[in-house]
């Protein structure tokens, strides 16, 4: 009789589909993730099951709190799709599919500098390239730890380029670039390249 009542409740909106989510949607291989399967009904004792494609990953019982499934994303196929099932007695409902986006982290970019020196100015071209990491990659250029460019998005494996003109400076300047893709909180920086101050013939990057 209880099963019948629960199934009847499901036909109304008292027992909607569960929700499957994760705080992290973009991950890299080897990353640990937590998946949360939750239900609006906080009074029922619910059995939650997690599936990926057509394999069963685990089952947990819960009442009022979401079920938490901890996984490690080590292979491409582990991106999903995932779904969870909420079951009360013989009645069950499924969540919508959830998939992770697996992104390879960017490696430290290489910064190259080319300078055209005139009597009064230096025309500087900065090139930045990260040879590994999922595209697109956003590059930002820095001078003395201050951003001097907007984020430059590259959808192919080609260097980002930024041009600037400087009055011949009296002191040396340090340039570096940052590479970042969709992985949150994961940015890498090039080694700094120092541009010496003007004085004598000290412009190692200059085109003569």
């Amino acid at each position: 009789r209880k099963a019948v009542l629960d199934c009847e409740a499901m036909k109304t909106n008292e027992f909607p589909s569960p929700c499957l989510d994760s705080k992290t949607k973009v991950v890299m291989k080897g990353q640990n993730v937590s998946m949360f399967c939750s239900h609006k009904n906080k009074s029922l004792q619910i059995t939650y099951s997690l599936f990926r494609r057509k394999t069963h990953l685990g089952t947990q019982d819960g009442k009022g709190e979401p079920a938490i499934f901890n996984l490690s994303i080590t292979e491409a196929h582990e991106s999903g799709p995932y779904k969870c099932k909420a079951q009360v007695t013989s009645c069950s409902k499924y969540s919508r599919d959830f998939s992770f986006t697996i992104v390879d982290p960017v490696t430290s970019p290489v910064l190259n500098i080319m300078v055209i020196q005139t009597e009064t100015d230096r025309h500087i071209t900065l090139h930045c390239l990260s040879v590994n990491g999922s595209l697109p990659i956003n590059y930002t250029f820095f001078e003395n730890h201050v951003a001097i460019s907007p984020a430059i998005s590259k959808y192919d494996r080609e260097p980002a380029e930024f041009n600037l003109t400087k009055k011949n400076p009296g002191e040396e300047e340090e340039y570096r670039c940052e590479a970042k893709n969709r992985l949150p909180n994961y940015a890498t920086y090039s080694h700094p390249v120092t541009m010496p101050s003007t004085g004598g013939d000290s412009c190692p990057f200059c085109l003569k």
């Epitope: 494609r53 057509k54 394999t55 069963h56 292979e75 196929h77």
Partner: antibody, heavy 119, light 112 residues
């Protein structure tokens, strides 16, 4: 080459125990599911149980309690421990591999090993 | 217990015939399509033909096709070839009473 090789079959007395092995080569058991299936002489295929890539095990109702599936990742081998054997357990026992993330799409099969339960 | 009923249990057909085998499940399979079909010849291990109810496994001739959803599934051989005389099994995957699989009892396709 991807293959499965069963071993450990033979003649056993009623009430006895036997452990079958399924040695996998060419792939890792930490990615794929292994399922045991049996076939009595002249009969159809019967699902015994499954161990998935996470080490979770699932059993047919009739196999639960008497049969246990385990694996040794270092040997890349899955085992089927069979206890309290009966005459009706006489069959060819197969292990089979599922597709990635699809436990029961069994695309790689071993050659089978014959278990005979008789006094 | 879940019942997977295959019909017919045997049939006789000629080369070139169109053959249809059905599988009726007592419960819906997981995702409504967690069903596969296998071919087995005497003394040999089974061979996967169809998965996801209708998708052809690698290397399987296109004369084999599958259809159906939920509880009712069909395997069709559009033009029977001499090498197709064998026994065919369906296998369903379920999550209703635990994670569970069940084979149909088999259909033997014989030469008429």
């Amino acid at each position: 080459e991807v293959q499965l090789v069963e071993s450990g079959g033979g003649l056993v007395q009623p009430g006895g125990s036997l452990r079958l092995s399924c040695a996998a080569s060419g792939f890792s058991l930490t990615i794929y599911t292994i399922t045991w299936v049996r076939q009595a002489p002249g009969k159809g295929l019967e699902w015994i149980g499954t161990i998935n890539s996470y080490g979770n095990t699932y059993y047919s109702t009739w196999a639960k309690g008497r049969f246990t599936i385990s694996r040794d990742n270092s040997k890349n081998t899955v085992y089927l421990q069979m206890n309290s054997l009966r005459a009706e357990d006489t069959a060819v026992y197969y292990c089979a591999r599922g597709y990635v993330d699809s436990d029961w799409y069994l695309n790689i099969w071993g050659q089978g090993t014959l278990v005979t339960v008789s006094s | 217990a879940i019942q997977m009923t295959q019909s017919p249990s045997s049939l006789s057909a000629r080369v070139g015939d169109r053959v249809t085998i059905t599988c009726q499940s007592s419960e819906s399979v997981y995702d409504n399509n967690y069903l596969s079909w296998y071919q087995q010849k005497p003394g040999k291990a089974p061979k996967l033909l169809i998965y996801d109810a209708s998708r052809l496994a690698s290397g399987v001739p296109s004369r084999f096709s599958g259809s159906g959803s939920g509880t009712q599934f069909t395997l069709t051989i559009s033009s029977l070839q001499p090498e197709d005389f064998a026994t065919y099994y369906c296998l369903g995957g379920y999550d209703s009473s635990g994670w569970y699989a069940a084979f149909g009892q088999g259909t033997k396709v014989e030469i008429k």
